[in-house]
Interface confidence: low
């Protein structure tokens, strides 16, 4: 390790004196940092001596000496104070800049230790500091203010008393910079435009930084335009906004434009597209078949999907019949934006009855005309079934009847014993019609078929079923013969045995 | 831009009280390191300076007027007030306010007048 | 207070000529000094603040210089617009004080 002499670590020197400040260490040795021009430096074999003829107070610091072969790397300092009774301080830096959170070191250097006792730190102008300004203070080094906010950054004098009276030191500007997170924020306004040509305009690029040091620029597909800037600060956070303003638009403003800005983060940047259109519009869609099928008693949501510019100016949900003529209620209709120009209309048809079903309509209107969008909305019923016996051209027939919606399928079954239901282990004989006669099917109505079984004999101790099915569920009916010895003949295509 | 304006009653008798607004755009007294100052200068005299008001409403009055000024400010409507009492025909004057502006917006406030207004003739007599 | 005395308090040059302007402090004012110009019927004019920084929009024929209590402005290559009055004003100390002005007269 390096030795300096005078051995120090302090020296005290009046203006103009020689200071000679020799380190000697085992091997070459060299003073740090910049020498000012008023000092000599010579070698002197395994030495090396500083020397000045005449000190002033601007030679007030800390000089340190190092070993560079030293692998420990070591290395000696003094401070030498050359105490000026007209400048008590030595200002090392006009400036100083710190991120946010760090501690800001001021270097005015006392010239006179004894001093130290008398110093204060102020704001220019003598302002007192800042509350909660939390500080500290160093002869060798200056004043620290500790963990430095951004409203710290400000002008600052160190004070000293001198026989009684405050002198100041030159002015040092504390710069506190915000740690920057990230690439500015970033707006453009609106996120979709549509215009008919000749209408006027406006998009709105705004990018706001915690730091004034950033850019911002709107471009329209590739070029970028030159637009006047405004700025502003407010919520602690700078703000630069960009206003596009075009007063008739034309095709050629159609496109797509971003809004970029950049800080030494990086880069951000969002895009809008401008449509331009020759006249007003309005498009009407559902995701949904226009053909619904519900089964009565369940719900259904119409959703219309709705693309319009001018805005809409009107609009309701109709019922068109066939049942009543009830309207649906405003309650259960619903409107839903999903941007500017695109909105989404419900109709919530909640325990569907037999009379709500039929025609369903949505009509908008807008500068462009009307729309409408219609759905048939069916409901779904599972099958009711009666069977009757009758006599047909002289003949025992059984009569089945069976209603509902989808068109129901009819089987006949021939069972061993009473029973109002046969089961599988009591199947006889089976007999699918597959055509069977269909009496009513009107829009929006049950299916009604009729089924036709031919008996000769139905006997005795036996059961026959007439069975209905659809997509939603299945009815049944069972006939007990009541008289014995009776046959059944069911039509040859008809039969087959489980 | 920024733009400044003083208005005053122009004529008033001694021991009266002066009442002078400075109107202002293209800043806000609510701007970190901002200020305005009043400064007078007497027919064929030099340049007095009054008052200072700084945006945290920190008020820096000249010593040998002090007891007669009061400097104030309204930041809603951009104005800057100064009232100085007991006239005397010695507070003839042509009446200026300036803004203290930032240098480097808002790490450092400004130490020096940037923007003045075009004065206003203030003069005291019986 | 401080006390600024500006020298010469009139001056006369000729277009294209150099001049210069002093200020000074009866006490240091550690560089905290502002030059302006006034013309007359009109508002006074910053040029230099903090002894030697232009202020912007100022032509780079203006400078400022000194340290302690002595201070100048120099106006390089006059032109006949610099016929103005000229005055310091230091702000190291409250209250704020003004050097007298110097008139500078165009031949």
């Known amino acids: 390790i390096p030795v300096i002499e005078p051995s120090g670590p302090e020296l005290v020197v009046k203006p103009g004196e020689t200071v000679t400040l020799r380190c000697v260490g085992n091997g070459s040795v060299e003073w740090d940092g910049p020498i000012s021009p008023h000092w000599t430096l010579y070698s002197d074999g395994p030495s090396s001596v500083l020397t000045t003829t005449n000190a002033t107070f601007q030679n007030t610091r800390t000089y340190r000496c190092t070993e560079p072969g030293d692998p420990l790397g070591g290395s000696a300092a003094i401070h030498l104070y050359v105490k000026d009774p007209a400048r008590p301080w030595n200002v090392l830096a006009k400036e100083v800049v710190v991120f946010e959170d760090q501690d800001a070191l001021l270097p005015c250097l006392l010239t006179d230790p004894v001093l130290e006792a008398g110093v204060s730190l102020v704001r220019l102008r003598g302002r007192p500091l800042m509350r909660h300004t939390n500080y500290s203070f160093s002869p060798w080094h200056g004043f620290t203010i500790h963990r430095a906010k951004f409203i710290q950054g400000q002008d600052y004098q160190c004070s000293a008393l001198m026989g009684g009276r405050k002198v100041m030191s030159i002015s040092i500007r504390l710069k506190v910079q915000k740690v920057i997170p990230g690439p500015p924020a970033l707006t453009l306004v609106p996120a979709e435009l549509v215009r008919i040509r000749g209408e006027a305009a406006q998009i709105v690029c705004s990018a706001s930084n915690i730091d004034v040091d950033f850019d911002v620029f709107l471009q329209h597909n590739t070029t970028k335009l030159a637009i006047p800037q405004r700025s502003d600060f407010h919520d602690n956070r700078y703000q630069k906004v960009l206003t596009l303003s075009l007063g008739q638009v034309d095709f050629q403003h159609a496109g797509n434009y971003s809004c970029v800005a950049s800080n030494v983060q990086g880069k951000h940047s969002t895009s809008m597209f401008f449509r331009v259109v020759e006249s007003a519009y309005l498009d009407l869609s559902s995701e949904q078949n226009l053909i619904q099928e519900v089964t009565v008693g369940e719900g259904l949501n119409l959703k219309v999907m709705v693309e319009a510019y001018p805005g809409l100016q009107g609009f309701n949900w109709t019922y068109l019949g066939p049942f009543s003529d009830h309207q649906p209620e405003p309650k259960l209709a619903n409107a839903t934006t999903k941007d500017t120009y695109r909105h989404t209309f419900t109709l919530s048809l909640p325990r569907l009855k037999p009379s709500e079903a039929g025609c369903y309509s949505f009509l908008a209107r807008n500068p462009g005309g009307w729309r409408a969008l219609t759905f048939e909305l069916t409901l779904r019923y599972p099958p009711e079934v009666s069977v009757i016996w009758t006599s047909i051209n002289g003949s025992g027939t059984l009569l089945c009847a069976a209603s509902g919606y989808p068109q129901p399928n009819v089987t006949w079954l021939q069972c061993a014993g009473h029973t109002d239901r046969c089961d599988e282990a009591q199947v006889l004989q089976v007999w699918v019609d597959p055509h069977p006669e269909v009496l009513s099917q009107e829009p929006f109505q049950k299916v009604t078929v009729q089924s036709l079984l031919t008996a000769e004999t139905l006997e005795h101790n036996q059961t026959y079923e007439c069975r209905a099915h659809n997509s939603v569920g299945s009815g049944s009916w069972a006939f007990i013969p009541i008289s014995a010895g009776a046959r059944t003949h069911p039509p040859d295509e008809f039969l087959f045995t489980p | 831009q920024v733009t400044l304006k003083e208005s005053g009653p122009g004529i008033l008798q001694p021991s009266q009280t002066l009442s002078l607004t400075c109107t202002f755009s293209?800043?806000?007294?609510?701007?970190?390191?901002?200020?305005v100052g009043w400064i007078r200068q007497p027919s064929g005299k030099g340049l007095e300076w009054l008052a200072n008001i700084w945006w945290d409403d920190d008020k820096y009055y000249n010593p040998s007027l002090k007891n007669r000024l009061t400097i104030s400010k309204d930041t809603s409507n951009n104005q800057a007030f100064l009232k100085l009492t007991n006239v005397h025909t010695s507070d003839s004057a042509t009446y200026y306010c300036?803004?203290?502006?930032?240098?480097?917006?808002?790490?450092?406030?400004?130490?020096?007048?940037?923007?003045w207004g075009p004065g206003t003739m203030v003069t005291v007599s019986s | 207070d401080i006390q600024m005395t500006q020298s010469p308090a009139s001056l006369s040059a000729s277009l294209g000529e150099t001049v210069s302007i002093e200020c000074l402090a009866s006490?240091?004012?550690?560089?905290?000094l502002a030059w302006y110009q006034k013309k007359p019927g009109k508002s006074p004019h910053l040029l230099i603040y903090y002894a030697s920084s232009l202020q912007d929009g100022v032509p780079s024929r203006f400078s400022g210089s000194g340290s302690g209590t002595q201070y100048s402005l120099k106006i390089n290559s006059l032109e006949s617009e610099d016929a103005a009055t000229y005055f310091c004003?230091?702000?190291?100390?409250?209250?704020?004080?003004f050097g007298g002005g110097t008139k500078l007269e165009l031949k």
């Open positions: 006490e240091d004012i550690y560089d905290n």
């Open positions: 293209g800043f806000s007294l609510t701007t970190y390191g901002m200020g």
């Open positions: 300036a803004r203290i502006g930032p240098i480097k917006y808002p790490t450092a406030p400004y130490r020096y007048f940037d923007f």
């Open positions: 004003l230091q702000d190291s100390e409250y209250p704020w004080t």
